[in-house]
Each structure stands twice: as C-alpha cells, then as structure tokens.
C-alpha cells in the first residue's frame, strides 16, 4: 500500500497511489482538488 | 479560457466497451488531475475516480470492480475513460472535470459538456 | 465508504424567501478544522457547478446569497433569497476520503 495524505496530516493507505502536501510550483505533481495540498507525485 | 472538450454520444451493446475521451485545453494539461463522474438518466452525481495526467497514475471507485479504464495522452492533452461489460445500468451521462485544491486561494470548477453513453440491446 | 443523505428530497420557495438544504454524512468529514464538504449547483442539461467549499467558502463567482454552514457530519446550504435562476437540483459532496461521494440531491422549485 501507498500513502495518501491531506496537509493537515490526515492519512489513509489506499490503493497503489502516493499522495502528499507538494508546492505546485515545484512542478512534481498533479493538482487532485477539493483537499489541502494534495497532489499526485507518483 | 481553461475548456474540457469530450467525444459525442455513444450507443453500445451489453457487454461491449465505451472509451470517453476529455480534450484539456487553456492550461498547463499535467498539472491538474481530471475526474469522471457519472449521472444516470433523472440520477444523482457518482464519482468513477481520477488520473493524473503528470504521471498516469489513477484512483478508480471500487465499485466498478476493474471494469474502468483511465489513461492519457500527453501528446493532445487528452484523458480517456474505458468503461467494460457495460450493462443497462450504466446508461448514464459521463462528465469530466477539473478542481482546484482548498489551498489555492481560489476554487474552481472546470467540466466537459458530458457524453451520453446508451447500453440498450 | 461515507455515505451522504440531503434533505428535503425537493423544496418549493417563493421568490424572495430563505431556501435551506441539509446534509448528514454517514461519518465525519472533517479533519484538523477543516471540512470537506462542497455543495454544487445543477441544472437542466449542464454539468454541476460548485458554489461551496469547504462547508462554508464561496467558489469563483458565485453570489452572495449563497452561503454553507456546518462542521462534522451535519451541514447545511442556504439560499438567502431565492431567485428565479436558482431553480436547479443541488447537491452536497464530501472530498476526505476516496471514493469520493455525492448526496442524492435536493431539486429547488418556485412555490
């Protein structure tokens, strides 16, 4: 299992997905949307 | 202007496969993850998943028990929905969509107009 | 998975009054102060809209009017006062945890 994790700490393994708090300027992910900090680094 | 543009309606066969697709345009296509979402004829909203164009990845609703599909192509900016042993019940409008997190200082909507996917024998 | 349950199914309000819509969810949808509760517009022949999230944050363009309420499983949208284009369904949608899921909608009519 991965990890899927909002900014505020709350997490859950779900499916083979890492998930995790990423500046979008740093250009490493995808936006997932309607949470805080979530995006799709791999 | 950011704009989700999706492929016409289909009419399919049970048990036959449906490919959706959703054209991203206006905005930088890797950055932003794409959802599916699903309303039966006179329905309510359901959420299939979503893939991230950046890296391919997706997060599908377990409730299509691996009978969903989502792909992309960085190429054309392009997210395809396959949708398998299709059966009356997935008579629905299919639309993609695009969020912005909380986080961003402002939140908005993006969606495709919706394709209309018919399973009749 | 949350279950969401809104309430009334359907509301019929004249132009001009106060139209409220709840939401229960099966679980608590919030999470270190914040919930994950958005609220959408719908109507007739076009895709959803959002208007709120959050629980209680406007979306992009949307009027004052509109506004969200609530914390945990229990929330709520109100139309402070109705008009004529705010006939639609609406429905309310919790984003904490996957699968996403969506209430069954509450159709807003003119009384």
């Known amino acids: 299992d991965a990890e899927f994790r909002h900014d505020s700490g709350y997490e859950v393994h779900h499916q083979k997905l890492v998930f995790f708090a990423e500046d979008v300027g740093s250009n490493k992910g995808a936006i997932i949307g309607l949470m805080v900090g979530g995006v799709v680094i791999a | 202007q950011v704009q989700l543009v999706q492929s016409g309606a289909e009419v399919k066969k049970p048990g036959a496969s449906v490919k959706v697709s959703c054209k991203a345009s206006?905005?930088?296509?890797?950055?932003?993850?794409i959802h599916w979402v699903r309303q039966a004829p006179g329905q309510g909203l359901e959420w299939m998943g979503f893939t991230s164009p950046y890296s391919g990845v997706s997060n599908y609703n377990q409730k299509f028990k691996g009978r969903v599909t989502m792909t992309r192509d960085t190429s054309t900016s392009t997210v395809y929905m396959e949708l398998s042993s299709l059966r009356s019940e997935d008579t629905a409008v299919y639309y993609c969509?695009?969020?912005?997190?909380?986080?961003?200082?402002?939140?908005?909507?993006?969606w495709g107009q919706g394709t209309l996917v018919t399973v009749s024998s | 998975d949350i279950v969401m349950t809104q309430s009334p199914d359907s509301l019929a309000v004249s132009l001009g009054e106060r139209a409220t819509i709840n939401c229960r969810a099966s679980?608590?949808?919030?999470?270190?102060?914040?919930?994950?509760l958005n609220w959408y517009q719908q109507k007739p022949g076009q895709p959803p809209k959002l208007l709120i999230y959050?629980?209680?944050k406007q979306g992009t363009g949307v009027p004052d009017r509109f506004s969200g309420s609530g914390s945990g499983t229990d929330f709520t949208l109100t139309i402070s006062s109705l008009q004529a284009e705010d006939v639609a369904v609406y429905y309310c949608?919790?984003?904490?945890?996957?699968?996403?899921?969506f209430g069954g909608g509450t159709k807003v009519e003119i009384k």
């Open positions: 959050a629980a209680t």
């Open positions: 949608q919790q984003s904490k945890v996957f699968p996403w899921s």
């Open positions: 969509a695009r969020f912005d997190n909380y986080d961003r200082g402002y939140v908005r909507d993006y």
């Open positions: 679980e608590s949808v919030d999470n270190d102060r914040i919930s994950f």
């Open positions: 206006g905005y930088t296509f890797t950055t932003y993850a």
